[in-house]
């Protein structure tokens, strides 16, 4: 890619809002947008909520003053709104816009998440940072769909199961799957929440070995691609704190059993490198299969210069570094 440093298009958001923390290109009806997450912004649509964050839409072409406007997600202004039988939401400092993803099709919808969203139903005992995601329609106007993938009725323990999962710290959208990283599940072993939009069910990660690896942060980064076959979608999750060096897993989304089945794993090389904290699935060699780039931003040979490891797909989920 060639970058043009001479004539950049420059969009600006509110001060101290972390405007630009997540950025996404979106198009709908011949209009191109840049969507920008500002996870520490105040929201004009929820003035009584403390810095919930916001997603801004910036029109790319006919927009001479480079104005960006906040998306209205129709989320109301109350603290303690019911979100289920044992669920009351607290949106203060929820970090809406921490991650953004787009469904890869003409009328693709947009996924926007707030990983610090909290369920305060049991606040006398536990405040549960489940995390929250919102599916925005392609036109960026109509009301969308709310997702709290970690909420389960009558479950109230912080740390245990999905109590503090913080879903949405990372997100990815395929045509049929909504993939949300949840690094706080199972005492921060982490997990990946995958919603199949075709039948509105979640695919489960039942791998005991992974679920018992506490404090590894699986789900800190997620992506998806064609790893086992050009026509199937597999899900990738990074666990940057695994054994201190970081790990990445690829899972097959098995529709029949409704589960995620591990088909590949790779580990980082250096302690503290945070290997797996960023991921990119891309076909580098044009063979129809996704290859994988894994970021390790704290990798240090000289001084925390970081490293990207490239894995080339040899077929059937066998990747070669």
């Amino acid at each position: 890619y060639n970058l043009d440093p001479q004539r950049p298009v420059h969009f600006q958001g509110p001060a101290d809002s972390f405007f630009g923390y997540a950025v996404l290109e979106h198009f709908h009806d011949n209009t191109r947008w840049v969507l920008v997450g500002a996870p520490k912004a105040d929201s004009k649509y929820s003035p009584s909520v403390k810095s919930p964050g916001a997603v801004f839409k910036c029109r790319v072409h006919t927009n001479p003053d480079r104005r960006c406007t906040e998306l209205d997600m129709a989320r109301g202004k109350n603290r303690g709104t019911s979100c289920g039988k044992t669920c009351r939401e607290d949106r203060d400092d929820e970090w809406m816009g921490v991650s953004l993803a787009r469904q890869p099709k003409a009328d693709g919808r947009v996924l926007a998440c707030a990983h610090r969203w909290k369920n305060i139903y049991y606040e006398a005992d536990h405040i549960l940072p489940h995390g929250f995601c919102y599916i925005i329609p392609s036109n960026l106007q109509a009301k969308g769909r709310t997702l709290i993938p970690c909420y389960e009725e009558y479950k109230k323990k912080y740390g245990e199961e999905h109590g503090s999962c913080q879903a949405g710290i990372a997100g990815f959208f395929t045509e049929e799957l909504v993939v949300m990283g949840a690094p706080g599940s199972f005492y921060w072993a982490g997990t990946i929440k995958v919603l199949n939009l075709t039948d509105n069910t979640y695919l489960k990660l039942n791998d005991e070995v992974i679920m018992n690896r506490r404090y590894t942060y699986l789900g800190y980064a997620v992506t998806a691609g064609h790893f086992s076959h050009p026509s199937t979608i597999d899900v990738v999750g990074g666990a940057p704190q695994d054994k201190g060096i970081g790990k990445v897993y690829i899972f097959r989304a098995d529709r029949r059993s409704g589960t995620l089945i591990k088909i590949f794993q790779a580990s980082g090389k250096k302690m503290g490198s945070y290997f797996g904290s960023s991921l990119c699935a891309v076909d580098l060699n044009g063979d129809g299969l996704s290859d994988l780039l894994v970021g390790a931003p704290m990798f240090s040979e000289i001084r925390d210069e970081g490293q990207v490891t490239v894995y080339i797909n040899r077929g059937n989920g066998a990747l070669e570094e």
């Epitope: 109301g76 303690g80 009301k143 769909r145």
Partner: antibody
């Protein structure tokens, strides 16, 4: 444009059953829940139940359990309400409505209603 | 089941007058309340959801408020086209239940 088109009025005999339809346009019913609501002449609104068309899961008011069956056909973007063993108490207008998958939302679009008259 | 008690059952107001309709739930419904308007011979229409959020396209003279078990809807300046029956509905727990309705007429 979002629309819910309901089937025409029905005149049925006591003891018979009837199946009402609700066809959506302008949106995919798999992205919503479809609800059915009953309104007897000059009376209030009663929630019958709903369906998640993506997987067929249903919820009913216990009062209508056994009386009403809600189904959906995603290929035709249509939801159905089947009412059985009809009596004069079932004479009413039946509405379908959509509810976006939004936990603090409500029924934002309604069909025009289908009038069911039970009479011998 | 959660009971919704709506009052008054009917009222008449002059054009420009402020109208308030209230709804009481038999238990805390945590803002899970919607208000609907139904004109004679027509389907209900959503006015307010989440207790105080105005539905797109609804005139700003309509507003909702309340919390816990007590909720109300206000019409700031009654207009002839506001003649209708108004229903509240709780969406906190299944079965969802409606209030008995308030028939609003013009004086």
């Amino acid at each position: 444009e979002v629309q819910l088109q309901q089937s025409g009025a029905e005149l049925v005999k006591p003891g018979a059953s009837v199946k009402l339809s609700c066809t959506a346009s302008g949106f995919n019913i798999k992205d919503t829940y479809v609800h059915w609501v009953k309104q007897r002449p000059e009376q209030g609104l009663e929630w019958i139940g709903n369906i998640d068309p993506a997987n067929g899961n249903t919820k009913y008011d216990p009062k209508f359990q056994g009386k009403a069956t809600i189904t959906a056909d995603t290929s035709s973007n249509t939801a159905y309400l089947h009412l059985s063993s009809l009596t004069s108490e079932d004479t009413a207008v039946y509405y379908c409505a959509r509810w976006l998958r939004h936990f603090y939302y409500a029924m934002d679009y309604w069909g025009q209603g289908t009038s069911v008259t039970v009479s011998s | 089941d959660i009971q919704m008690t709506q009052s008054p059952a009917s009222l008449a107001a002059s054009v420009g007058e402020t109208v308030t309709i209230t709804c009481r739930a038999s238990e805390n419904i945590y803002y899970s309340l919607a208000w609907y308007q139904q004109k004679q011979g027509k389907s209900p229409q959503l006015l307010i959801y989440n207790a105080n959020s105005l539905e797109d396209g609804v005139p700003s003279r309509f507003s909702g408020s309340g919390s816990g078990t007590q909720y109300s809807m206000k019409i700031n300046s009654m207009q002839p086209e506001d003649t209708a029956t108004y229903f509240c509905k709780q969406a906190y727990d299944v079965p969802y239940t409606f209030g008995g309705g308030t028939k609003l007429e013009i004086k």
